[in-house]
């Protein structure tokens, strides 16, 4: 079970520093954006991160939505990352979800962030590059340290 | 203005019961998580429950598990905390809060605290 | 839960910098940023100095900061004022069955 807690609005980066956003196709891609790029593509950059309270000790228990005509909510369903048309619930009744992420500090890097499914035990949101684009998958953690799967997030609220 | 208002505190004699309630005022109360929090005279602070956004989660210290039960009516504003089976070591001010959790904005508000006497 | 440990008393003279700590664990202070400090001074309800480990609302002085290292939280105050007497309080989310701990508080006295 999960209980919204409240939610805030962030910008999240990946360690080389690019900004994650929505392109127009709705895919969550990164890129080297300046603050004032990030201010000029926002709401498309500004994403809702809802907090929830998980019924089992496994930790604080998140979603993350973006606002653009309306509000989109990231899923993992069969491992493929993607936006869904929808609302974070403020219940949910069951412990796995595709649209929760357990969001934890990295030991010894506290201001780093890891959001590791709820559906998919050890897997991980990473960015990874796919040709010249910078994309936000699902991954299965495969070494300690893997930068790709730790991420900082910025308060812009 | 944001404003928290306890109401329904008093005396009451051990095994008895209470009702505490909360009305808030100038901000999105169903957009927050709530708590009730305790002092007991000349001591720390406890928190005592929490409860989610829609109320579906309720969450309580060891010490009141099984006895306080926490609920929300977002339609009006409110807050409550029920409270059974009262012991003298329940006695103390019980203020209601919205503790900051994350976030630039969150907040911080706390009501002015009811006094809950337990004693025969 | 248990809760955080604080010592129960520190002191110190106008114009010094003193340290309160406020020990956890993984499950609370060690796994999440979401750690705060409270300032009560007797008969007032708690106000907010520091959230998430480090930042400060507006309105607060800067001569408040906190920071964090494994399972332990810490407060700092420089410039110690007649004013900032009071006790303190470190709270943290806990993944526990529970919501919010706090600590067990730290009476400052400005000496």
């Known amino acids: 079970y999960f209980g919204k807690l409240e939610s805030k609005l962030s910008v999240i980066r990946n360690l080389n520093d690019q900004v994650l956003f929505i392109d127009q196709g709705n895919r969550p891609l990164f890129e080297d954006m300046t603050d004032s790029d990030c201010r000029d593509n926002a709401p498309r950059t500004i994403f809702i991160i809802s907090m929830y309270k998980d019924s089992q000790p496994r930790g604080m228990a998140v979603t993350i939505s973006v606002k653009c005509e309306k509000i989109s909510t990231l899923s993992c369903e069969n491992k493929i990352i993607s936006f869904k048309e929808m609302n974070p619930p403020d219940n949910i009744k069951d412990t796995k979800s595709d649209i929760i992420f357990f969001q934890r500090s990295v030991p010894g890097h506290d201001n780093k962030m890891q959001f590791e499914s709820s559906s998919y035990e050890g897997y991980f949101l990473a960015c990874e590059k796919e040709r010249d684009l910078f994309k936000l998958i699902l991954k299965k953690e495969d070494e300690l340290g893997d930068r790709s799967i730790m991420f900082t997030v910025q308060n812009e609220d | 203005e944001v404003q928290l208002v306890e109401s329904g505190g008093g005396l009451v004699q051990p095994g008895g019961s209470m009702r505490l309630s909360c009305t808030a005022s100038g901000f999105t109360f169903d957009e927050y998580a709530m708590s009730w929090v305790r002092q007991a005279p000349g001591k720390g602070l406890e928190w005592v429950s929490g409860i989610s956004t829609g109320g579906g989660g309720t969450y309580y210290a060891d010490s009141v598990e099984g006895r306080f039960t926490i609920s929300r009516d977002n339609s009006k504003n409110t807050l409550y905390l029920q409270m059974n089976s009262l012991r003298a070591e329940d006695t103390a001010v019980y203020y209601c809060a919205k503790p900051w959790l994350s976030g630039s904005r969150s907040g911080d508000f706390w009501g002015q605290g009811t006094l809950v006497t337990v004693s025969s | 839960q248990s809760a955080l440990t604080q010592p129960a008393s520190v002191s110190g003279s106008p114009g010094q910098s003193i340290t309160i700590s406020c020990t956890g664990t993984?499950?609370?202070?060690?796994?999440?940023?979401?750690v705060s400090w409270y300032q009560q001074h007797p008969g007032k309800a708690p106000k907010l100095l520091i959230y998430e480990v480090s930042h400060r609302p507006s309105g607060v002085s800067d001569r408040f900061s906190g920071s964090k290292s494994g399972n332990t939280a810490s407060l700092t105050i420089s410039g110690l004022q007649a004013e900032d007497e009071a006790d303190y309080y470190c709270?943290?989310?806990?993944?526990?069955?529970?919501?919010?701990?706090f600590g067990t508080g730290t009476k400052l006295t400005v000496l």
């Open positions: 993984s499950s609370d202070v060690g796994g999440y940023n979401y």
């Open positions: 709270s943290s989310f806990t993944s526990s069955s529970s919501l919010y701990v």
